[in-house]
């Protein structure tokens, strides 16, 4: 009992004057609180609290549930307590079966005893299973059994409080421990798409997935460089113990150009934070941008293949693509495909495959593409390189020898004279006249060149060679001359094609 110092308020005194009292079930509990300023008795056990304004607390027939702490308080707020055990062999434990523990913290299994004199007060696993090896506990007959430093592995552990009574083990009702996990890593965040491209007025919706061990993870969508609170919709799931998933969906029902920017999904817990971003670009209307993958002026040798390749950005999706030549649309020989299978891809490739091109197939090849908003086109000028072909080689009435050759690039015509029967014509003869003629064929076709020399310059028998050549190859034609007296005759001309 407390000692009294004169002039200072003292705690009340309780009779019987001991800290613990043991009574048998059915016996009377009589507690007297002596204090001039008595206010109340309070009884506490587990979550239950009762009050009594009488200074004498009387329970005529004590029950096990009357076990607990009886506290007398005076008007100065000073108090004194006695703990009463109501010994009941049929009810050794008072229990509150709710059992929650925070990971790494201690938690109390609330199974106070009604008889402090029983032995081996401890915890046991259900159905004879052993407790985890690392589980440590401290028994307290008045409060229960404290489990030290709760582990995540103890989650859903089934337990009994246990005592030995007269040599036999007695178990309480079962407890199932629920462990509230501690955060030991940052949340895992991911976003449905890393970038979005929209037209004005379209709906922007993006979902952030947050994964963590519990639902107390914090998450939010933020706009970079803005404090405005964004409207989010949540869904969440408990995928088993310590596996919580939340989906935070951000929606702008009618996006505007000035909504463009970077949006961040941010999540944090007591361990740390994580974030992921998505980029929104809102355009006032769709677009198509075409990028040729080869030069738009193409030179190709006769009989060879060439691929005309474009990449293009199209938003929204391209709806019509075609390749055109000479007002004719290709139905085959071309393919069009997305640059990547990514859902947000806006880049595409189109390839026209031209095979074994003829000299007559040069010209403008046009790629056209359109979507719901715009059309776009790109033209390729294809030139087919052809070896010169000698179209005519004649002796004109005025005594001129004339050679006409066609090819691409423009052929050059050289003249040579071979005296007598020599096979090699090396002495060059300067032409009198050289002209490039307009071709009657399409543009990008062969170029025609006409060259003439004066045959009167030749005084001896021999052969005149007209040689037409360009980057691709060369072709020759020959005029044979024989003198009969003073007369010169042209013997049949012939050509010799030289690769």
């Amino acid at each position: 009992q407390p000692s009294v110092s004169p002039g200072e308020p003292s705690p009340p005194s309780i009779h019987p004057g001991k800290s613990d009292l043991i009574v048998r079930v059915g016996d009377e509990i009589r507690l007297l609180c002596t204090d001039p300023g008595f206010v109340k008795w309070t009884f506490e056990i587990l979550d239950e609290t009762n009050e009594n304004k009488q200074n004498e607390w009387i329970t005529e027939k004590a029950e096990a549930t009357n076990t607990g702490k009886y506290t007398c308080t005076n008007k100065h707020g000073l108090s004194n307590s006695i703990y009463v055990f109501v010994r009941d062999p049929a009810k050794l434990f008072l229990v509150d079966r709710s059992l929650y523990g925070k990971e790494d913290n201690d938690t109390l299994v609330r199974c106070p005893l009604t008889d402090p004199e029983v032995t081996n007060y401890s915890l046991k696993g259900c159905q004879g299973k052993p407790l985890p090896k690392d589980l440590r506990f401290i028994p307290d007959p008045k409060a229960g059994i404290m489990i030290k430093s709760v582990k995540r592995a103890y989650h859903r552990l089934c337990l009994h409080c246990s005592v030995d009574q007269e040599g036999k083990s007695v178990l309480s009702e079962k407890f199932i421990l629920k462990v509230r996990p501690a955060f030991k890593a940052v949340p895992v965040v991911s976003v449905s798409k890393a970038s979005y491209l929209l037209r004005e007025g379209e709906e922007f919706t993006v979902t952030c997935t947050i994964k963590d061990v519990s639902s107390s993870v914090y998450s939010t969508w933020k706009r970079e460089n803005s404090q405005t609170k964004l409207q989010e919709k949540y869904n969440s799931w408990h995928h088993g113990d310590f596996n919580y998933e939340r989906q935070a969906t951000l929606t702008i029902s009618s996006a505007r150009v000035n909504d463009s920017g970077v949006f961040m999904c941010y999540a944090n817990n007591t361990f740390g934070s994580a974030n992921v971003t998505t980029t929104l670009e809102v355009v006032d209307k769709g677009f198509i941008n075409i990028f040729p993958m080869i030069n738009t002026t193409v030179f190709v040798n006769d009989g060879e293949n060439v691929d005309l390749i474009v990449e293009y950005e199209a938003f929204p999706k391209p709806e019509h693509q075609q390749w055109i030549y000479m007002n004719r649309t290709f139905t085959d020989k071309w393919e069009d495909y997305p640059k990547s299978e990514n859902e947000s891809n806006i880049r595409y490739v189109s390839e026209l495959h031209l095979t074994r091109l003829k000299g007559t197939e040069g010209g403008t090849y046009t790629f056209l593409v359109s979507n719901s908003d715009v059309n776009a086109a790109i033209a390729f000028n294809v030139y087919v390189n052809t070896k010169p072909e000698i179209l005519t080689y004649d002796r004109l009435v005025n005594g001129m020898l004339q050679c006409v050759a066609a090819g691409f690039p423009e052929p050059t015509i050289d003249w040579y004279f071979c005296p007598g029967t020599e096979q090699r014509c090396s002495a060059s003869v300067l032409p009198v006249d050289v002209q490039t003629l307009n071709s009657s064929g399409p543009p990008f076709g062969k170029l025609v060149v006409q060259s003439s020399i004066d045959s009167s310059a030749f005084k001896h028998n021999g052969t005149v060679e007209c040689k037409a050549y360009n980057d691709v190859g060369k072709t020759s034609a020959y005029f044979n001359f024989a003198f009969k007296g003073n007369n010169k005759e042209q013997i049949h001309p012939h050509t010799l094609f030289t690769p």
Partner: antibody
Framework: EVQLLESGGGLVQPGGSLRLSCAAS????????MNWVRQAPGKGLEWVSA????????FYADSVKGRFTISRDNSKNTLYLQMNSLRAEDTAVYYC????????????WGQGTLVTVSS | DIQMTQSPSSLSASVGDRVTITCRAS??????LNWYQQKPGKAPKLLIY???DLQSGVPSRFSGSGSGTDFTLTISSLQPEDFATYYC?????????FGGGTKVEIK
């Protein structure tokens, strides 16, 4: 003793506003997610809204999204529900309920407060 | 949203009867299923959580079973104080949803 006590209910006209409070005692309030659940006269239970222990995240049923706002003041151990643009179909007893162990299991309920929306 | 369907919506039984109430989810909810009891004019009271775990203070005549989409609440021997309305609730995902209720009346 663990307890929840709602207040703030009453009669309100359609389009009007009301703020419900729920005073918590007997447990560490900030450790628990809290909820509002309602029950229209003669009908079943309908979850309305939830808020995490820190107050950082809030969740709503589609039927009240944009009109109701859940909040909490952990220093006062109090949960709130601000109800705007009230409709006749919001007439119900509103209960606050504690979520135990992170799992949206409502282990402690208040006694409820009646909200009547009528002209 | 996950729909919860309870059956029957009401039943009449006598004291001592064994009573079974079923609850079906529109998609799998694993074992995230809870049962509540509500008496007229009172707040609901948690009976069973995680499909089969008995809440502290709830008599052992109440039991729960099931997983996935089909769940059962059983009262092994009906007592006078058990006449009430019983609700199932899924806590697998938000939005949280309740069954329509089963009213247990005295025959």
């Amino acid at each position: 003793e663990v307890q929840l006590l709602e207040s703030g209910g009453g009669l309100v006209q359609p389009g009007g506003s009301l703020r419900l409070s729920c005073a918590a005692s007997g447990f560490t309030f900030s450790d628990y997610s809290m909820n509002w659940v309602r029950q229209a006269p003669g009908k079943g239970l309908e979850w309305v809204s939830a808020i995490t222990g820190s107050g950082g995240n809030t969740f709503y049923a589609d039927s009240v999204k944009g009109r109701f706002t859940i909040s909490r003041d952990n220093s006062k151990n109090t949960l709130y529900l601000q109800m705007n643009s009230l409709r006749a179909e919001d007439t119900a007893v509103y209960y606050c309920a504690r979520s135990n162990y992170e799992q949206d299991v409502f282990d402690i309920w208040g006694q409820g407060t009646l909200v009547t929306v009528s002209s | 949203d996950i729909q919860m369907t309870q059956s029957p919506s009401s039943l009449s039984a006598s004291v001592g009867d064994r009573v079974t109430i079923t609850c079906r989810a529109s998609q799998t909810i694993y074992r995230y299923l809870n049962w509540y009891q509500q008496k007229p004019g009172k707040a609901p009271k948690l009976l069973i959580y995680d499909a089969s775990d008995l809440q502290s203070g709830v008599p052992s005549r109440f039991s729960g079973s099931g997983s996935g989409t089909d769940f059962t609440l059983t009262i092994s021997s009906l007592q006078p104080e058990d006449f009430a309305t019983y609700y199932c609730q899924q806590s697998y995902s938000i939005p949280i949803t309740f069954g329509g209720g089963t009213k247990v009346e005295i025959k």
